[in-house]
């Protein structure tokens, strides 16, 4: 049978050849004509056999980390017969490890984030080194971790590579640390190889600082002309924290006048003092308010850092502005009866200079030929007014300071022209009526209605009558319907076209004004030769033809 021991070759041997061992058949007594052969991957290249003795040599430098074992086959032939002395056999050459690989941190770069003020023992990160050497071969791949840089704030567990906090750190003093970890193989014994890695440890912010005003007193000014909502200035607090932990809210702590407000600009973290109510220099020319600032987000466990909010005092000076004249009222409404004579009194407007110097005021009316105003604000008419032409006048009255003509105010003045009964009622339209020659008595000839250009305080009420002469002629009569209409009826039977082709009836219409006015209105009635049906349509048609120059038979 085959005789051999386990074959080992140390890796990284620098000699040109290294004796691995000897393959031998127990039938080989040294005098036999036995020839040994080596087959398989690595035979003839990595490993050479002395075919006469069976001695195997490694002729290449081997790297266990590249290949840790070779599986080869051995043959032995008796050259006298050419036959195999032993069955072909497989054997293994193991490459034995030497400590030729340093530990390597394969996952670098390492970066960790840990909250500031974390207590001792807080886990930061675990770093792991790999050693390509054989973990089962002595201590070649047994690693020990140590801290080369990072004391006294950090420590590393020697066997696990777990980095922990060993001292509290304040991000506001230093926000990141470079820690250098060394991994040594051979559990740190002499001849150990080492590798290092750097770990960037960043401290994340916790809200351990409250915002504090940069100034204990701010002086701001506001123009008395500033509208509400005007930003009159900014105040600023600083917070050593960052991000969300530095977000702050400003608010008013004291403002008896309730004139100001503070809003927070969350982009710049400034407090903006806002005018909540308009100020008046002449009324109050300075204010004092107190503002406070707090963080927007505060965790319960960090409340100890935020017990008293920082405050500041804000002095606000009101700046005087030359203000335009101020009318007593925002608008005026005056009334005047129509038909009053030119120069009649309409009303008085009044404006004053709100400033302390109290400039005299001049008044004017913009684009009006009907009214006039004097320096006392008295408005008079320049013409007689007719309500039926214009019942309202919209005036623009301007007040100008005498000392500063650029200071102008305008207000609307509405003048209502009041009605007087100066128009009698009249027909609402022109009426042309027709009656048949054969018309009977009491036949309705026309319904009439009236209009009155005057304004009625209540309802207009019109009264209809025939004139005295027409009443006496008695060919027609009128009935007042009591609804501002009346009907004209025949007062006899039969009419003669030849004798009296047209009747002109005078109708009196009176209104219910005080005093009452009456008008006389003429109604024209044509006599027609009607057909048997008594229709005046043909009569009207004939009239139409005649009016157009045609003659009808």
């Amino acid at each position: 049978g085959w005789v051999w021991n386990q074959f080992f070759v140390p890796e990284e041997m620098n000699t040109t050849s290294h004796h691995v061992g000897r393959l031998r058949s127990d039938l080989d007594n040294g005098n036999n004509s036995f020839q040994y052969k080596l087959l398989g991957a690595g035979a003839g290249s990595t490993f050479i056999i002395d075919e006469r003795t069976g001695d195997i040599y490694a002729i290449e430098k081997l790297d266990r980390e590249e290949r840790s074992l070779y599986i080869l086959r051995a043959q032995v032939i008796d050259i006298t017969t050419g036959r195999a002395v032993e069955p072909e056999s497989e054997f293994v050459i193991k490459v034995s490890d030497i400590n030729d690989n340093e530990p390597k941190f394969l996952d670098e770069p390492y970066e960790a984030i840990v909250p500031e003020m974390s207590p001792e023992g807080t886990l930061v990160i675990q770093v792991t080194a790999s050693d390509a050497d054989d973990p089962s071969s002595g201590n070649n791949a047994r690693l020990l971790y140590s801290l080369l840089q990072g004391q006294p704030y950090f420590s590393v567990e020697p066997t696990t590579g777990v980095i922990r906090i060993s001292s509290k750190m304040d991000r506001e003093l230093q926000d990141e640390y470079w820690v250098i970890i060394q991994a040594k193989d051979m559990i740190g014994q002499p001849g150990a190889l080492s590798g290092t890695t750097s770990v960037l440890i960043k401290l994340s912010d916790v809200n351990d600082n409250k915002p504090i005003f940069k100034e204990s007193l701010y002086r701001l000014t506001v123009s008395e002309s500033a509208p509400t909502g005007t930003s009159i200035g900014t105040i600023m607090a600083y917070d050593n924290d960052i991000g969300e932990n530095a977000e702050m809210d400003y608010s008013i702590e004291e403002d008896d006048s309730q004139t100001f407000d503070i809003i927070t600009n969350h982009e710049t973290q400034e407090g903006i003092v806002i005018l909540k109510k308009k100020v008046n220099f002449e009324h109050q020319n300075h204010y004092g308010i107190r503002a406070k600032v707090k963080n927007h987000h505060v965790d319960k466990q960090l409340m100890k850092y935020h017990t008293e909010a920082s405050t500041t005092f804000i002095k606000i000076q009101v700046e005087d502005v030359d203000e335009p004249p101020l009318f007593l009222l925002p608008y005026y409404i005056f009334e005047i009866f129509e038909e009053t004579p030119q120069g009649s009194f309409v009303g008085v407007v009044s404006a004053t200079d709100p400033d302390n110097r109290k400039s005299p005021i001049r008044y004017s009316i913009t684009r009006s030929k009907v009214f006039n105003i004097d320096d006392n604000g008295t408005i008079t008419t320049t013409n007689s007014l007719d309500r039926e032409i214009s019942a309202w006048y919209n005036l623009s009255i301007t007040a100008t300071e005498k000392y500063n003509i650029e200071q102008i105010s305008s207000i609307p003045v509405y003048v209502q022209v009041l009605n007087i009964n100066d128009h009698a009622p009249e027909f609402s339209q022109y009426y042309e009526s027709y009656v048949c020659e054969n018309a009977g008595s009491g036949q309705v000839i026309q319904t009439i209605s009236a209009v009155d250009r005057d304004e009625s305080i209540e309802e207009h009420h019109f009264y209809f009558n025939l004139s005295v002469e027409d009443t006496n002629s008695s060919s027609f009569t009128i009935i007042d319907n009591q609804d501002n209409t009346a009907v004209i009826l025949t007062n006899r039977t039969g009419f003669n076209l030849q004798e009296e082709p047209i009747f002109y009836i005078s109708i009196l219409i009176a209104d219910n004004g005080i005093p009452s006015l009456t008008s006389t209105n003429t109604l024209t009635i044509h006599v027609c030769d009607c057909d048997d049906s008594g229709s005046t349509q043909t009569c009207q048609y004939q009239e139409l033809m005649l009016s157009m120059g045609f003659k009808t038979e």
Partner: antibody, heavy 120, light 108 residues
Framework: QVQLQESGPGLVKPSETLSLTCTVS????????WSWIRQPPGKGLEWIGY???????NYNPSLKSRVTMSVDTSKNQFSLKLSSVTAADTAVYYC??????????????WGQGTLVTVSS | EIVLTQSPGTLSLSPGERATLSCRAS???????LAWYQQKPGQAPRLLIF???SRATGIPDRFSGSGSGTDFTLTISRLEPEDFAVYHC?????????FGGGTKVEIK
């Protein structure tokens, strides 16, 4: 063609170590077996042993205890050391090429030989 | 080890004559692994025959080898003046390699 040249001291004192070197030219030492053969004056040839280019050796049992062979492929040389010499070791020492891998072969070519005398 | 015995120890012949040299092994030589060398005074041996019967490169055909097992022969068909020398046989079928004592061919 391949040529071999022995070199070393021609005189060695008894009990000392005889050292010879064979330099191969005109070809590589790698891939071959290299032998040392000696011939005492007026006598026959005696095979001392061989060295394979990888360093494997096989010595004549009659001399095994005193012989050491080595090879330096980078210099294309191989060497012989024979320790504890006596007058009986006086001979012409030849180096010769045996075959390449495989069983033993004849010797060809040979060096021209160097005479080593053991004498005090 | 295999002991090779060469005979005769000396062979006296004239040029042009045939020379027959014998080499006998103490045990069979594997696969006829036997070689013949020629050695002239002051020179290294020179290979003539290997494998019992194969001529080495450049060797004249008047030299021939034969035999197997334990008996081997070197024949020089017509001796030339330059052929007068010592002839050695060597077996390489077993370790250690051994040589015969040599046969001297001299001019008669």
């Amino acid at each position: 063609q391949v040529q071999l040249q022995e070199s070393g001291p021609g005189l060695v004192k008894p009990s000392e170590t005889l050292s010879l070197t064979c330099t191969v030219s005109g070809g590589s030492i790698s891939g071959y077996y290299w032998s040392w053969i000696r011939q005492p004056p007026g006598k026959g040839l005696e095979w001392i042993g061989y060295i394979y280019y990888i360093g494997s050796t096989n010595y004549n049992p009659s001399l095994k205890s005193r012989v050491t062979m080595s090879v330096d492929t980078s210099k294309n040389q191989f060497s012989l050391k024979l320790s504890s010499v006596t007058a009986a070791d006086t001979a012409v020492y030849y180096c010769a090429r045996d075959g390449s891998s495989g069983w033993y072969r004849w010797f060809d070519p040979w060096g021209q030989g160097t005479l080593v005398t053991v004498s005090s | 080890e295999i002991v090779l015995t060469q005979s005769p120890g000396t062979l006296s012949l004239s040029p042009g004559e045939r020379a027959t040299l014998s080499c006998r092994a103490s045990q069979s030589v594997s696969s006829s692994y036997l070689a013949w060398y020629q050695q002239k005074p002051g020179q290294a041996p020179r290979l003539l025959i290997f494998g019992a019967s194969s001529r080495a490169t450049g060797i004249p055909d008047r030299f021939s080898g034969s035999g197997s097992g334990t008996d081997f022969t070197l024949t020089i068909s017509r001796l030339e003046p330059e052929d007068f020398a010592v002839y050695h046989c060597q077996q390489y079928g077993n370790s250690p390699l051994t040589f015969g004592g040599g046969t001297k061919v001299e001019i008669k």
